[in-house]
């Protein structure tokens, strides 16, 4: 059973990853951001369920496609390199679900915007710290 | 339809600079990224970084990064490669490519004629 | 960087017969969201730059003639040219378009026997 301690860490890096994905999306929807439109061409791939830690496999396995839309971007939209921020993400994400863990992600059918994506993904931070707190 | 075209061959003493230039016509050069690509004699390809010409974002590979950098020139519709501490293993063939479809990672579907530089003292 | 590892470094084949190229990636180059490979295949002549032949493992580039197929998932990729006419003659390069930097194997030269 997880204990308090365990418990305070993973809501910790929760809202770590939560502050992360806010900021990305801040950046992109920042007015100054003249790549938006173009930006909103690319497609990510949602989770069919998100519900649990296991199912931040589903965001690792697109973390790639993020950091190369995210180099598109003026630099000054974030306060760190899209590799430095992605690498950051992916540590936090592979602590939360386990690296030991072997869950094949199931995706939808629909594909999303990378405002859409970012948006499912905040959510589900939202949603998982709402229930340690 | 699509073209790019290179400046012609270059030859640099070592430590110099040199500027590479890649003119695009049947296309809107801000419509797409510009890569640029070199190839030593007898080698392989070698990817060195990509420009979006409309706003003028780049990004390099970390091993050209500080000695490269890539510009771009709207209103001649014309990209430019400029390499400086030329040292002669720099010496290629370096090409400008273009892309299938907007994308940093998609592949490179249009290719100039390339420019060999020369690097000798 | 992901490395490309491509075998053999030349291959000689008679005219008509079949030409298979191998190349390996150092992670895999599968997206699972879409199922898609990010591999493309290039083929360059002398003092010529390379040209495209095929994307996303399996897609043809438009133009290019139906005996070059690709195919392979994951790290495993296989260029086949299904008989070989004398102008394919050529240096073959894999190249992964999966993350930056893209990188390209070594390439593979291709003569007639």
């Known amino acids: 059973a997880p204990t308090s301690s365990s418990t305070k860490k993973t809501q910790l890096q929760l809202e770590h990853l939560l502050l992360d994905l806010q900021m990305i999306l801040n950046g992109i929807n920042n007015y100054k951001n003249p790549k938006l439109t173009r930006m909103l061409t690319f497609k990510f791939y949602m989770p069919k369920k998100a519900t649990e830690l296991k199912h931040l496999q589903c965001l690792e396995e697109e973390l790639k496609p993020l950091e190369e839309v995210l180099n598109l971007a003026q630099s000054k939209n974030f306060h760190l390199r899209p590799r430095d921020l992605i690498s950051n993400i992916n540590v936090i994400v592979l602590e939360l679900k386990g690296s030991e863990t072997t869950f094949m992600c199931e995706y939808a059918d629909e594909t999303a915007t990378i405002v859409e994506f970012l948006n499912r993904w905040i959510t589900f931070c939202q949603s998982i710290i709402s229930t340690l707190t | 339809q699509v073209q790019l075209v290179q400046s012609g061959a270059e030859v640099k003493k070592p430590g110099s600079s040199v500027k590479v230039s890649c003119k695009a016509s049947?296309?809107?050069?801000?419509?797409?990224?510009i890569h640029w690509v070199r190839q030593a004699p007898g080698q392989g390809l070698e990817w060195m970084g990509w420009?979006?010409?409309?706003?003028?974002?780049?990004a390099y590979a970390q091993k050209f990064q500080g000695r490269v950098t890539l510009t771009a020139d709207t209103s001649t519709s014309t990209a430019y490669m400029e390499l400086s501490s030329l040292r002669s293993e720099d010496t290629a063939v370096y090409y400008c490519?273009?892309?299938?479809?907007?994308?940093?990672?998609?592949?490179?579907?249009?290719w100039g004629q390339g420019t060999l530089v020369t690097v000798s003292s | 960087d992901i490395v490309m590892t491509q075998s053999p470094d030349s291959l000689a084949v008679s005219l008509g017969e079949r030409a298979t190229i191998n190349c390996k990636s150092s992670?895999?180059?599968?997206?699972?969201?879409?199922?898609?490979?990010?591999l493309a295949w290039y083929q360059q002549k002398p003092g010529q730059p390379p040209k495209l032949l095929i994307y996303?493992?399996?897609t043809g580039q438009s133009g290019v003639p139906d005996r070059f197929s690709g195919s392979g998932s994951g790290t495993d990729f296989t260029l086949t040219i299904s008989s070989l006419q004398a102008e394919d003659v050529a240096v073959y390069y894999c190249?992964?378009?999966?993350?930056?930097?893209?990188?390209f194997g070594a390439g593979t030269k291709v003569e007639i026997k």
């Open positions: 996303y493992a399996s």
């Open positions: 490519a273009r892309s299938l479809d907007y994308d940093p990672i998609y592949p490179f579907a249009y």
């Open positions: 049947g296309y809107s050069i801000t419509d797409y990224l």
């Open positions: 420009i979006d010409p409309e706003d003028g974002v780049t």
């Open positions: 190249q992964q378009h999966y993350v930056t930097p893209p990188t």
């Open positions: 992670q895999s180059l599968l997206r699972n969201g879409n199922q898609k490979n990010y």
